[in-house]
């Protein structure tokens, strides 16, 4: 014998008080699958949590974090404080990246600069707390007489066509 509740679609619940007919979820509740005997209460995004997606009868609300914080945990269950680029969050708060490391985001940890020599390359641009080093051509490519970079075309003044 088929369970009459299995016919109740998402957005409804099987109402035992009304001969197991399918009733719509009440306001501020939802059911994301069919055959539910109750609807779940919608999540409320309060305080540091902002509403990213409103609750509907078939899906829960989704929250994100107010500026200055970023989401942590499944479904953004927590908001962690941002740091500045060039810093990482430690047990003592936001701390500058140590020399030889960088962080180009407001979250996460400082990572070591790329070691260009491991790829047989030279450092073209030094690293900073906020940016990784930029590796250039290998030192052999920079020997005298070797053109490592194509020189830029001479600049022209706007409005003048070449002679």
């Amino acid at each position: 014998l088929q369970d009459p509740c299995s016919n109740c679609p998402a957005g409804t619940f099987c109402d035992n008080n009304r001969n197991q007919i399918c009733s719509p979820c009440p306001p501020n509740s939802f059911s994301s699958a069919g055959g539910q005997r109750t609807c779940d209460i919608c999540r409320q995004c309060k305080g540091v949590f902002r509403t990213r997606k409103e609750c509907s009868s078939t899906s829960n609300a989704e929250c994100d974090c107010t500026p200055g914080f970023h989401c942590l945990g499944a479904g953004c269950s927590m908001c962690e404080q941002d740091c500045k680029q060039g810093q990482e969050l430690t047990k003592k708060g936001c701390k500058d990246c140590c020399f030889g490391t960088f962080n180009d985001q407001k979250r996460g940890i400082c990572r070591p600069w790329t070691n260009c020599s491991l790829d047989g390359k030279s450092v073209l641009v030094n690293g900073t707390k906020e940016r990784d080093v930029v590796c250039g051509p290998s030192p052999a490519d920079l020997s005298p007489g070797a053109s490592s970079v194509t020189p830029p075309a001479p600049a022209r003044e706007p409005g003048h066509s070449p002679q």
Epitope: V48, S77, M78, K91, G93
Partner: nanobody
């Protein structure tokens, strides 16, 4: 061990003010966000306010915005709630609570330590 002890509750007339305090010990207070939560007679828990670890970011339940101010003194390991323009509907037991991770604000379900509460009664 972590301890949170609230004080400052009492009986006050509508329109009056109270300042609640929460003295914290047993953890590095300055590294954790803190909250005030209340429970009115016969009702469920209601989040009131959050403050981040450094005190520069504060958040409030809509019904208390502009009337309540959360603050903290990290040197004294103390959390405060200044309550002005009190109404009968603010009558509740007020709890302070600690968030579970450093420099992180959680939802009320995840707070890991709570005080024993202090009763605020607003009645004329």
């Amino acid at each position: 061990q972590v301890q949170l002890v609230e004080s400052g509750g009492g009986l006050v007339q509508p329109g009056g003010s109270l300042r609640l305090s929460c003295s914290a010990s047993g953890f590095t207070f300055s590294s954790y966000a803190m909250s005030w939560v209340r429970q009115a007679p016969g009702k469920g828990l209601e989040w009131v306010s959050d403050i981040n670890s450094g005190g520069e970011s504060t958040f409030y339940e809509d019904s208390v915005k502009g009337r309540f101010t959360i603050s903290r003194d990290n040197a004294k390991n103390t959390l405060y709630l200044q309550m002005n323009s009190l109404r009968a509907e603010d009558t509740a037991v007020y709890y302070c609570a600690k968030h579970p991770l450093t420099y992180t604000i959680a939802t009320m379900n995840d707070y890991d330590y709570w005080g024993q509460g202090t009763l605020v009664t607003v009645s004329g």
